[in-house]
Interface confidence: low
Protein backbone atom coordinates (compact mmCIF):
# COMPACT_ATOMS: atom_id res chain seq x y z
CA UNK A 1 0.00 0.00 0.00
CA UNK A 2 0.93 3.64 -0.36
CA UNK A 3 2.67 4.81 2.80
CA UNK A 4 0.66 7.12 4.96
CA UNK A 5 2.26 10.31 6.22
CA UNK A 6 2.86 10.31 9.97
CA UNK A 7 0.73 12.70 12.02
CA UNK A 8 0.41 13.90 15.62
CA UNK A 9 4.18 14.13 15.97
CA UNK A 10 4.82 14.80 19.65
CA UNK A 11 7.94 15.20 21.73
CA UNK A 12 7.80 13.39 25.08
CA UNK A 13 10.71 14.57 27.19
CA UNK A 14 11.48 14.56 30.89
CA UNK A 15 14.83 15.62 32.34
CA UNK A 16 16.16 15.34 28.75
CA UNK A 17 15.10 11.71 28.23
CA UNK A 18 13.43 12.42 24.89
CA UNK A 19 11.19 10.33 22.67
CA UNK A 20 9.42 11.41 19.50
CA UNK A 21 6.00 9.79 19.13
CA UNK A 22 3.60 9.80 16.18
CA UNK A 23 0.69 7.99 14.53
CA UNK A 24 -0.55 5.82 12.81
CA UNK A 25 0.59 2.22 13.15
CA UNK A 26 2.13 1.35 9.76
CA UNK A 27 0.78 -1.29 7.40
CA UNK A 28 3.05 -2.51 4.63
CA UNK A 29 5.48 0.31 5.20
CA UNK A 30 8.00 1.39 7.82
CA UNK A 31 9.18 4.61 9.38
CA UNK A 32 12.58 6.20 9.56
CA UNK A 33 13.22 9.23 11.72
CA UNK A 34 15.69 11.93 10.76
CA UNK A 35 17.03 14.56 13.13
CA UNK A 36 19.17 17.54 12.19
CA UNK A 37 22.43 18.15 14.00
CA UNK A 38 24.16 21.47 14.63
CA UNK A 39 25.72 21.34 11.18
CA UNK A 40 22.17 21.00 9.79
CA UNK A 41 22.91 17.51 8.50
CA UNK A 42 20.11 14.95 8.71
CA UNK A 43 20.91 11.82 10.69
CA UNK A 44 18.85 8.64 10.36
CA UNK A 45 17.48 7.15 13.58
CA UNK A 46 15.15 4.20 14.20
CA UNK A 47 15.78 3.10 10.65
CA UNK A 48 12.98 1.13 8.99
CA UNK A 49 10.98 0.66 12.18
CA UNK A 50 7.37 -0.38 12.60
CA UNK A 51 7.25 1.38 15.96
CA UNK A 52 5.54 4.73 16.34
CA UNK A 53 8.15 6.18 18.63
CA UNK A 54 11.87 6.85 18.49
CA UNK A 55 14.23 7.59 21.35
CA UNK A 56 16.29 10.63 20.32
CA UNK A 57 17.90 11.25 23.70
CA UNK A 58 21.43 10.50 22.48
CA UNK A 59 21.12 13.17 19.82
CA UNK A 60 19.49 15.99 21.77
CA UNK A 61 21.78 15.76 24.81
CA UNK A 62 24.74 16.70 22.60
CA UNK A 63 23.66 20.33 22.94
CA UNK A 64 20.57 21.09 24.99
CA UNK A 65 20.46 24.72 23.83
CA UNK A 66 20.09 23.83 20.17
CA UNK A 67 16.69 23.86 18.44
CA UNK A 68 16.47 20.43 16.80
CA UNK A 69 14.41 19.64 13.74
CA UNK A 70 13.14 16.13 13.11
CA UNK A 71 10.98 14.42 10.55
CA UNK A 72 9.33 11.04 10.22
CA UNK A 73 9.61 9.41 6.79
CA UNK A 74 7.12 6.80 5.63
CA UNK A 75 8.98 4.20 3.59
CA UNK A 76 7.32 1.45 1.48
CA UNK A 77 8.51 -2.04 2.42
CA UNK A 78 8.62 -3.51 -1.06
CA UNK A 79 10.53 -0.77 -2.86
CA UNK A 80 14.27 -0.65 -3.05
CA UNK A 81 15.53 1.77 -0.47
CA UNK A 82 19.00 3.24 -0.31
CA UNK A 83 20.03 4.81 2.97
CA UNK A 84 23.46 6.32 3.16
CA UNK A 85 23.85 8.54 6.16
CA UNK A 86 22.28 11.82 5.20
CA UNK A 87 20.31 10.46 2.24
CA UNK A 88 17.25 8.23 2.18
CA UNK A 89 15.75 7.78 -1.28
CA UNK A 90 13.29 5.44 -3.01
CA UNK A 91 13.97 5.16 -6.71
CA UNK A 92 15.53 8.61 -6.60
CA UNK A 93 12.68 10.25 -4.69
CA UNK A 94 12.45 11.22 -1.06
CA UNK A 95 9.65 9.30 0.67
CA UNK A 96 6.68 11.17 2.13
CA UNK A 97 7.53 12.75 5.46
CA UNK A 98 6.10 14.91 8.22
CA UNK A 99 8.07 17.52 10.14
CA UNK A 100 8.01 17.49 13.92
CA UNK A 101 7.73 20.77 15.82
CA UNK A 102 11.14 22.20 16.62
CA UNK A 103 12.49 20.89 19.91
CA UNK A 104 14.76 23.00 22.08
CA UNK A 105 15.66 20.71 25.00
CA UNK A 106 16.59 23.48 27.44
CA UNK A 107 13.20 25.09 26.91
CA UNK A 108 11.01 22.10 26.11
CA UNK A 109 11.99 19.15 28.28
CA UNK A 110 9.66 18.57 31.21
CA UNK A 111 11.09 18.66 34.68
CA UNK A 112 10.74 15.39 36.55
CA UNK A 113 9.19 15.10 39.97
CA UNK A 114 11.67 16.42 42.52
CA UNK A 115 12.72 14.37 45.53
CA UNK A 116 13.14 15.79 49.01
CA UNK A 117 16.53 14.51 50.09
CA UNK A 118 16.33 15.60 53.72
CA UNK A 119 14.41 17.93 55.98
CA UNK A 120 14.63 18.98 59.56
CA UNK A 121 12.60 21.24 61.77
CA UNK A 122 15.02 22.86 64.14
CA UNK A 123 13.33 25.23 66.54
CA UNK A 124 12.07 28.14 64.48
CA UNK A 125 13.67 26.93 61.24
CA UNK A 126 12.51 24.34 58.75
CA UNK A 127 15.50 23.27 56.65
CA UNK A 128 14.79 21.35 53.45
CA UNK A 129 17.24 19.93 50.89
CA UNK A 130 16.02 18.91 47.42
CA UNK A 131 17.96 16.19 45.65
CA UNK A 132 19.89 17.45 42.63
CA UNK A 133 18.79 14.70 40.28
CA UNK A 134 20.90 13.42 37.43
CA UNK A 135 19.95 14.08 33.82
CA UNK A 136 20.99 12.19 30.69
CA UNK A 137 23.17 15.11 29.58
CA UNK A 138 26.85 14.14 29.64
CA UNK A 139 30.01 16.17 29.99
CA UNK A 140 33.36 14.43 29.72
CA UNK A 141 31.65 11.08 30.18
CA UNK A 142 29.82 12.12 33.36
CA UNK A 143 26.09 12.64 33.66
CA UNK A 144 25.23 16.20 34.70
CA UNK A 145 22.74 17.12 37.39
CA UNK A 146 19.78 19.43 36.74
CA UNK A 147 21.64 22.21 38.54
CA UNK A 148 24.73 21.74 36.37
CA UNK A 149 22.60 22.02 33.23
CA UNK A 150 20.31 24.88 34.26
CA UNK A 151 22.49 26.79 36.73
CA UNK A 152 20.70 29.68 38.41
CA UNK A 153 17.85 29.36 35.93
CA UNK A 154 16.62 26.40 38.01
CA UNK A 155 14.58 27.21 41.07
CA UNK A 156 12.38 25.39 43.53
CA UNK A 157 9.03 26.36 44.98
CA UNK A 158 8.12 25.03 48.40
CA UNK A 159 4.48 24.96 49.39
CA UNK A 160 3.93 24.39 53.10
CA UNK A 161 1.23 24.50 55.74
CA UNK A 162 0.86 23.87 59.42
CA UNK A 163 0.01 20.22 59.85
CA UNK A 164 -3.46 20.97 61.15
CA UNK A 165 -4.26 23.83 58.78
CA UNK A 166 -5.53 24.20 55.22
CA UNK A 167 -3.90 27.60 54.61
CA UNK A 168 -0.79 27.32 52.42
CA UNK A 169 2.29 29.48 51.97
CA UNK A 170 4.92 29.34 49.26
CA UNK A 171 8.58 30.24 49.06
CA UNK A 172 10.96 30.26 46.08
CA UNK A 173 14.71 29.68 46.00
CA UNK A 174 17.25 29.32 43.21
CA UNK A 175 19.31 26.85 45.21
CA UNK A 176 18.44 23.30 46.29
CA UNK A 177 17.95 24.33 49.90
CA UNK A 178 15.26 26.15 51.83
CA UNK A 179 15.43 27.60 55.29
CA UNK A 180 11.97 28.74 56.31
CA UNK A 181 10.92 30.55 59.46
CA UNK A 182 8.28 28.49 61.25
CA UNK A 183 6.59 28.43 64.62
CA UNK A 184 8.40 26.48 67.28
CA UNK A 185 6.69 23.28 68.39
CA UNK A 186 4.29 23.28 65.43
CA UNK A 187 4.46 20.56 62.79
CA UNK A 188 4.48 21.38 59.08
CA UNK A 189 3.67 19.51 55.88
CA UNK A 190 5.19 20.54 52.56
CA UNK A 191 6.03 19.60 49.00
CA UNK A 192 8.37 21.11 46.40
CA UNK A 193 8.25 21.81 42.67
CA UNK A 194 11.14 22.55 40.36
CA UNK A 195 10.83 25.51 38.02
CA UNK A 196 12.82 27.11 35.22
CA UNK A 197 12.70 30.88 35.57
CA UNK A 198 13.35 31.70 31.90
CA UNK A 199 10.54 29.57 30.49
CA UNK A 200 7.28 30.88 29.15
CA UNK A 201 5.45 27.56 29.24
CA UNK A 202 6.27 24.22 30.80
CA UNK A 203 7.81 26.15 33.66
CA UNK A 204 7.07 23.92 36.67
CA UNK A 205 7.60 20.26 37.48
CA UNK A 206 4.99 18.08 39.15
CA UNK A 207 5.05 18.37 42.92
CA UNK A 208 7.16 16.06 45.04
CA UNK A 209 5.51 13.74 47.50
CA UNK A 210 4.17 15.64 50.48
CA UNK A 211 6.18 15.11 53.65
CA UNK A 212 5.51 16.28 57.16
CA UNK A 213 7.75 17.01 60.09
CA UNK A 214 8.06 14.38 62.78
CA UNK A 215 4.86 14.68 64.80
CA UNK A 216 2.68 14.26 61.71
CA UNK A 217 4.44 11.35 60.03
CA UNK A 218 2.28 8.74 61.79
CA UNK A 219 -0.92 10.36 60.51
CA UNK A 220 0.16 10.17 56.88
CA UNK A 221 1.32 6.58 56.94
Amino acid sequence: GIPEKAFNLTWISTDFKTILEWQPKPTNYTYTVQISDRSRNWKNKCFSTTDTECDLTDEIVKDVTWAYEAKVLSVPRRNSVHGDGDQLVIHGEEPPFTNAPKFLPYRDTNLGQPVIQQFEQNGRKLNVVVKDSLTLVRKNGTFLTLRQVFGKDLGYIITYRKGSSTGKKTNITNTNEFSIDVEEGVSYCFFVQAMIFSRKTNQNSPGSSTVCTEQWKSFLG
Epitope: T65, G151, K152, D153, S198, K200
Partner: antibody, heavy 116, light 107 residues
Framework: QVQLVQSGAEVKKPGESLKISCKGS???????IGWVRQMPGKGLEWMGW????????RYSPSFQGQVTISADKSISTAYLQWSSLKASDTAMYYC??????????WGQGTLVTVSS | DIELTQPPSVSVAPGQTARISCSGD??????VSWYQQKPGQAPVLVIY???NRPSGIPERFSGSNSGNTATLTISGTQAEDEADYYC?????????FGGGTKLTVLG
Protein backbone atom coordinates in the same frame (compact mmCIF):
# COMPACT_ATOMS: atom_id res chain seq x y z
CA GLN B 1 25.69 44.19 42.58
CA VAL B 2 26.49 42.50 39.29
CA GLN B 3 29.06 44.41 37.28
CA LEU B 4 30.74 43.84 33.93
CA VAL B 5 33.75 45.99 33.10
CA GLN B 6 34.98 46.09 29.51
CA SER B 7 38.38 47.01 28.14
CA GLY B 8 39.01 50.44 26.65
CA ALA B 9 38.46 51.83 23.16
CA GLU B 10 40.63 50.53 20.33
CA VAL B 11 41.77 52.07 17.05
CA LYS B 12 43.07 49.56 14.53
CA LYS B 13 43.98 49.23 10.88
CA PRO B 14 42.27 46.81 8.49
CA GLY B 15 43.87 43.36 8.63
CA GLU B 16 45.06 43.71 12.22
CA SER B 17 43.95 41.38 15.00
CA LEU B 18 42.19 42.41 18.21
CA LYS B 19 40.97 40.90 21.44
CA ILE B 20 38.66 42.86 23.75
CA SER B 21 37.69 41.77 27.25
CA CYS B 22 34.79 41.77 29.69
CA LYS B 23 35.50 41.15 33.37
CA GLY B 24 32.74 40.01 35.71
CA SER B 25 32.48 40.81 39.39
CA UNK B 26 30.08 38.02 40.31
CA UNK B 27 29.74 34.23 40.17
CA UNK B 28 31.06 34.28 36.64
CA UNK B 29 31.13 30.59 35.78
CA UNK B 30 27.45 29.92 36.47
CA UNK B 31 26.21 32.59 34.05
CA UNK B 32 26.24 32.97 30.30
CA ILE B 33 27.96 36.01 28.80
CA GLY B 34 26.60 37.40 25.54
CA TRP B 35 28.17 39.82 23.08
CA VAL B 36 26.18 42.46 21.18
CA ARG B 37 27.31 44.73 18.36
CA GLN B 38 26.00 48.21 17.66
CA MET B 39 27.28 49.85 14.48
CA PRO B 40 27.29 53.67 14.38
CA GLY B 41 23.72 54.97 14.38
CA LYS B 42 22.29 51.47 14.11
CA GLY B 43 20.48 48.94 16.30
CA LEU B 44 21.61 46.06 18.49
CA GLU B 45 22.78 42.78 16.98
CA TRP B 46 23.36 39.58 18.95
CA MET B 47 26.75 38.06 18.13
CA GLY B 48 26.97 35.02 20.34
CA TRP B 49 27.45 33.78 23.87
CA UNK B 50 29.73 31.70 26.02
CA UNK B 51 29.17 29.67 29.16
CA UNK B 52 32.48 30.26 30.97
CA UNK B 53 32.12 27.17 33.17
CA UNK B 54 32.90 24.88 30.22
CA UNK B 55 33.58 27.43 27.44
CA UNK B 56 30.62 26.24 25.40
CA UNK B 57 29.81 28.84 22.75
CA ARG B 58 27.00 29.67 20.36
CA TYR B 59 27.32 32.17 17.50
CA SER B 60 24.76 34.06 15.50
CA PRO B 61 24.94 32.78 11.89
CA SER B 62 25.89 36.32 10.85
CA PHE B 63 29.01 36.25 13.02
CA GLN B 64 30.02 32.58 12.79
CA GLY B 65 33.60 32.42 11.53
CA GLN B 66 34.02 36.19 11.77
CA VAL B 67 34.81 36.43 15.48
CA THR B 68 35.87 34.12 18.31
CA ILE B 69 34.35 34.21 21.77
CA SER B 70 36.38 32.76 24.62
CA ALA B 71 36.68 32.99 28.39
CA ASP B 72 39.16 32.52 31.21
CA LYS B 73 37.07 31.52 34.20
CA SER B 74 40.06 31.75 36.55
CA ILE B 75 40.01 35.54 36.13
CA SER B 76 36.25 35.86 35.45
CA THR B 77 36.86 37.33 32.01
CA ALA B 78 35.23 36.78 28.62
CA TYR B 79 36.82 37.80 25.33
CA LEU B 80 35.78 38.73 21.82
CA GLN B 81 38.47 38.56 19.17
CA TRP B 82 39.12 39.14 15.48
CA SER B 83 42.01 37.68 13.51
CA SER B 84 41.70 40.18 10.66
CA LEU B 85 39.69 43.35 11.16
CA LYS B 86 37.68 45.07 8.44
CA ALA B 87 36.44 48.64 8.26
CA SER B 88 32.90 47.25 8.66
CA ASP B 89 33.85 45.97 12.13
CA THR B 90 33.82 49.56 13.37
CA ALA B 91 31.20 49.53 16.11
CA MET B 92 30.47 49.59 19.82
CA TYR B 93 30.65 46.12 21.34
CA TYR B 94 28.81 45.27 24.54
CA CYS B 95 29.06 42.25 26.77
CA UNK B 96 26.12 41.37 28.97
CA UNK B 97 25.04 38.69 31.39
CA UNK B 98 22.78 36.56 29.26
CA UNK B 99 19.94 34.09 29.59
CA UNK B 100 18.19 33.05 26.37
CA UNK B 101 16.68 36.24 25.03
CA UNK B 102 17.43 38.21 28.15
CA UNK B 103 20.45 40.46 28.74
CA UNK B 104 20.07 41.70 32.28
CA UNK B 105 23.37 43.43 33.05
CA TRP B 106 25.51 45.20 30.48
CA GLY B 107 29.10 46.29 30.32
CA GLN B 108 29.82 49.91 29.47
CA GLY B 109 30.83 48.98 25.91
CA THR B 110 34.08 48.96 23.96
CA LEU B 111 34.34 51.21 20.91
CA VAL B 112 36.35 49.59 18.11
CA THR B 113 37.40 51.83 15.21
CA VAL B 114 38.96 50.25 12.14
CA SER B 115 40.40 52.73 9.70
CA SER B 116 43.36 52.92 7.37
CA ASP C 1 13.66 32.28 12.52
CA ILE C 2 11.44 34.99 13.90
CA GLU C 3 11.90 38.62 12.79
CA LEU C 4 10.93 41.49 15.07
CA THR C 5 9.54 44.70 13.58
CA GLN C 6 9.31 47.99 15.48
CA PRO C 7 8.16 51.44 14.33
CA PRO C 8 11.19 53.69 13.79
CA SER C 9 9.77 56.46 15.97
CA VAL C 10 7.04 57.25 18.48
CA SER C 11 6.23 60.68 19.94
CA VAL C 12 4.38 61.41 23.15
CA ALA C 13 3.56 64.48 25.24
CA PRO C 14 4.90 64.55 28.81
CA GLY C 15 2.51 62.84 31.23
CA GLN C 16 0.80 60.90 28.46
CA THR C 17 1.04 57.17 27.76
CA ALA C 18 3.56 55.95 25.20
CA ARG C 19 3.09 52.60 23.50
CA ILE C 20 5.84 50.97 21.48
CA SER C 21 4.95 47.87 19.47
CA CYS C 22 7.08 44.92 18.44
CA SER C 23 5.59 42.47 15.96
CA GLY C 24 6.62 39.02 14.82
CA ASP C 25 4.98 35.81 13.66
CA UNK C 26 3.29 34.14 16.66
CA UNK C 27 5.34 36.34 18.97
CA UNK C 28 2.99 35.66 21.87
CA UNK C 29 4.46 32.18 22.23
CA UNK C 30 7.90 33.64 22.95
CA UNK C 31 9.19 35.63 25.88
CA VAL C 32 9.95 39.23 24.94
CA SER C 33 12.31 41.58 26.73
CA TRP C 34 12.69 45.34 26.28
CA TYR C 35 15.79 47.53 26.52
CA GLN C 36 16.16 51.27 26.92
CA GLN C 37 19.23 52.96 25.48
CA LYS C 38 20.03 56.61 25.97
CA PRO C 39 22.63 58.37 23.79
CA GLY C 40 26.19 57.38 24.67
CA GLN C 41 25.06 54.77 27.21
CA ALA C 42 24.78 51.00 27.34
CA PRO C 43 21.30 49.47 27.03
CA VAL C 44 19.31 48.83 30.20
CA LEU C 45 16.82 46.01 30.62
CA VAL C 46 13.41 47.52 31.47
CA ILE C 47 11.05 44.55 30.93
CA TYR C 48 11.73 40.83 30.79
CA UNK C 49 9.55 37.74 30.23
CA UNK C 50 6.87 39.94 28.59
CA UNK C 51 5.73 41.92 31.61
CA ASN C 52 8.24 41.70 34.46
CA ARG C 53 10.17 44.73 35.70
CA PRO C 54 13.71 44.35 37.06
CA SER C 55 14.35 46.01 40.40
CA GLY C 56 15.03 49.71 40.03
CA ILE C 57 12.84 50.17 36.96
CA PRO C 58 9.95 52.58 37.61
CA GLU C 59 6.41 51.21 37.79
CA ARG C 60 5.34 53.34 34.84
CA PHE C 61 7.06 50.77 32.57
CA SER C 62 4.93 47.75 31.72
CA GLY C 63 4.76 45.16 28.98
CA SER C 64 2.32 42.81 27.32
CA ASN C 65 2.61 40.14 24.65
CA SER C 66 -0.06 38.19 22.81
CA GLY C 67 -0.84 37.07 19.29
CA ASN C 68 1.72 38.62 16.97
CA THR C 69 2.46 41.77 18.96
CA ALA C 70 4.34 42.70 22.12
CA THR C 71 3.88 46.19 23.53
CA LEU C 72 5.97 48.30 25.86
CA THR C 73 3.78 50.84 27.67
CA ILE C 74 5.14 53.86 29.52
CA SER C 75 2.43 55.52 31.61
CA GLY C 76 2.91 59.13 32.58
CA THR C 77 5.90 59.50 30.30
CA GLN C 78 8.67 61.75 31.59
CA ALA C 79 11.33 63.69 29.71
CA GLU C 80 13.98 61.29 31.03
CA ASP C 81 12.24 58.42 29.18
CA GLU C 82 13.34 59.84 25.83
CA ALA C 83 15.58 57.10 24.41
CA ASP C 84 15.81 54.28 21.91
CA TYR C 85 13.85 51.15 22.86
CA TYR C 86 14.57 47.65 21.57
CA CYS C 87 12.53 44.47 21.89
CA UNK C 88 14.22 41.08 21.85
CA UNK C 89 13.38 37.40 21.97
CA UNK C 90 14.97 33.98 21.62
CA UNK C 91 14.09 31.57 18.85
CA UNK C 92 15.73 28.50 17.35
CA UNK C 93 18.96 28.94 19.28
CA UNK C 94 19.27 32.53 18.14
CA UNK C 95 18.65 35.81 19.93
CA UNK C 96 16.81 38.40 17.89
CA PHE C 97 16.53 42.16 18.45
CA GLY C 98 13.96 44.44 16.89
CA GLY C 99 15.26 47.36 14.84
CA GLY C 100 14.62 49.85 17.65
CA THR C 101 12.17 52.70 18.22
CA LYS C 102 13.18 56.27 19.02
CA LEU C 103 10.83 57.64 21.67
CA THR C 104 10.57 61.43 21.59
CA VAL C 105 8.99 63.23 24.53
CA LEU C 106 7.53 66.44 23.08
CA GLY C 107 7.87 69.88 24.59
Amino acid sequence: QVQLVQSGAEVKKPGESLKISCKGSYSFTSNWIGWVRQMPGKGLEWMGWIYPSDSMTRYSPSFQGQVTISADKSISTAYLQWSSLKASDTAMYYCARYLFGLFDNWGQGTLVTVSS
Amino acid sequence: DIELTQPPSVSVAPGQTARISCSGDNLGSYYVSWYQQKPGQAPVLVIYNDNNRPSGIPERFSGSNSGNTATLTISGTQAEDEADYYCATYDSSTDVFGGGTKLTVLG
